[in-house]
């Protein structure tokens, strides 16, 4: 039994780091290899991860963490009984991927701007809390062409667009997600998709010829 | 419930010696690392032996590496500091403290044994 | 060694009062510091560990904050209860353990 690709890791600096690695043939990751980690430190216990099985030849392992400090450094080791395997080093700080935002809801009740507002991801002690951009992907379920990014570059996990920016009458989707530059992290996830139908109502003049066109067609 | 229970304080004379004890329950005491803290009429606390889970490494400041050894019996779910040499300014209330599980801060203490060093 | 400074040393408070008790420390210690609350002939007790996180069982009104070398306890509304010594201690670069001279809050 032998690794075919090391195990990388990613943190959500917070409590969960994810390591995923592949083996060299068909294995069941969680009966026969475990996961050692520790901090590096003289006391700190270690702690065992039970993978589980991601593909036939990949495994995944959630390690739990205590919260993360910037200068945190774990030794890991991959055992499979009493072989070892790997063994190699994972510091939380250089592999973030954020956790993604969530509850994600739009607001259309003023009629000519969508409100859409989501949950930072992380307490307002965590670090990540006041470091988060976000992107926001809309798109139409009727027509694949039509699909937007908006970029959020401030704090406030909310964005307003112009009604008038989609077009009416169709249903649209959303969704987010997260990254911070201060540690150059990687995104998150994209956050569920939240669905609404835009109802926009033109101004008469524009809604009359827009009908008109439509006619044609 | 984590308890930690000091016991070997007392009265000594200079330059003799003294060996503490610390009685854990309520918890794995093999897996944790353990320490010694003392504290100083002048209530200052000082760290003063750390020992890891399986007793292969030690560590001691300067003010007492030579005199003292940390030890540990994790079939009797014993601490021990064993003093020698002992100094007035070794006059304190000697707590033993359990290293948090994911930090080296203490997260339970002893409510500590008094040694007294005088002629 | 990291040497740690605590202030003030002692300070006067009536109950419901915003304490705050800082501690410095000589070198970078990111945020590997504990903090404690010890009362007359008791053990120290654990109430925050990595500069923010309390520990278990500690109430809200208690809260630490900073990284670095300049770290704060503390207390929204002091209770009668919280009158006591409190101490900093670092953790980082272990095999090495440092406390702060301790903040005694006396009651006014």
């Known amino acids: 039994m032998k690794v075919l690709q090391e195990p990388t890791c990613v943190s959500d600096y917070m409590s969960i780091s994810t390591c995923e690695w592949k083996m060299n043939g068909p294995t069941n990751c969680s009966t026969e290899l475990r996961l050692l980690y520790q901090l590096v430190f003289l006391l700190s216990e270690a702690h065992t991860c039970i993978p589980e099985n991601n593909g036939g030849a990949g495994c995944v392992c959630h390690l739990l963490m205590d919260d993360v400090v910037s200068a945190d450094n774990y030794t890991l080791d991959l055992w499979a009984g009493q072989q070892l395997l790997w063994k190699g080093s994972f510091k939380p700080s250089e592999h973030v991927k954020p956790r993604a935002p969530g509850n994600l809801t739009v607001h259309t009740n003023v009629s000519d701007t969508l409100l859409l507002t989501w949950s930072n991801p992380y307490p307002p002690d965590n670090y990540l809390y006041n470091h988060l951009t976000y992107a926001v992907n809309i798109w139409s379920e009727n027509d694949p062409a039509d699909f937007r990014i908006y970029n959020v570059t401030y704090l406030e996990p909310s964005l307003r667009i112009a009604a008038s920016t989609l077009k009416s009458g169709i249903s649209y989707r959303a969704r987010v997600r997260a990254w911070a530059q201060c540690y150059n992290t990687t995104w998150s996830e994209w956050s569920p998709s939240t669905k609404w139908h835009n109802s926009y109502r033109e101004p008469f003049e524009q809604h009359h010829h827009h009908h008109h066109h439509h006619h044609h067609h | 419930e984590v308890q930690l229970v000091e016991s070997g304080g007392g009265l000594v004379q200079p330059g003799g010696s003294l060996r503490l004890s610390c009685a854990a329950s309520g918890f794995t005491f093999s897996t944790y690392g353990m320490s010694w803290v003392r504290q100083s009429p002048d209530k200052r606390l000082e760290w003063v032996s750390t020992?890891?889970?399986?007793?292969?490494?030690?560590s001691y400041p300067d003010s007492v590496k030579g005199r003292f050894t940390i030890s540990r019996d994790n079939a009797k779910n014993t601490l021990y500091l064993q003093m020698r040499s002992l100094r007035a300014e070794d006059t304190a209330v000697y707590y033993c403290?359990?290293?948090?599980?994911?930090?080296?801060?203490?997260?339970?203490w002893g409510q500590g044994t008094l040694v007294t060093v005088s002629s | 060694d990291i040497q740690m400074t605590q202030s003030p040393s002692s300070l006067s408070a009536s109950v419901g009062d915003r304490v705050t008790i800082t501690c410095r420390t000589s070198e970078n210690i990111y945020s590997y510091l504990a903090w404690y609350q010890q009362k007359p002939g008791k053990a120290p007790k654990f109430l925050v560990y990595?500069?923010?996180t309390l520990a278990e069982g500690v109430p809200s009104r208690f809260s630490g904050s900073g990284s670095g070398t300049d770290f704060t306890l503390t207390i929204s509304s002091l209770q009668p209860e919280d009158f006591a010594t409190y101490y900093c201690q670092h953790y980082y670069g272990p095999p090495t353990w440092t406390f702060g001279q301790g903040t005694k809050v006396e009651i006014k």
């Open positions: 020992i890891n889970s399986n007793g292969g490494s030690t």
């Open positions: 403290a359990r290293f948090f599980r994911f930090r080296n801060a203490m997260d339970y």
């Open positions: 990595n500069a923010k």
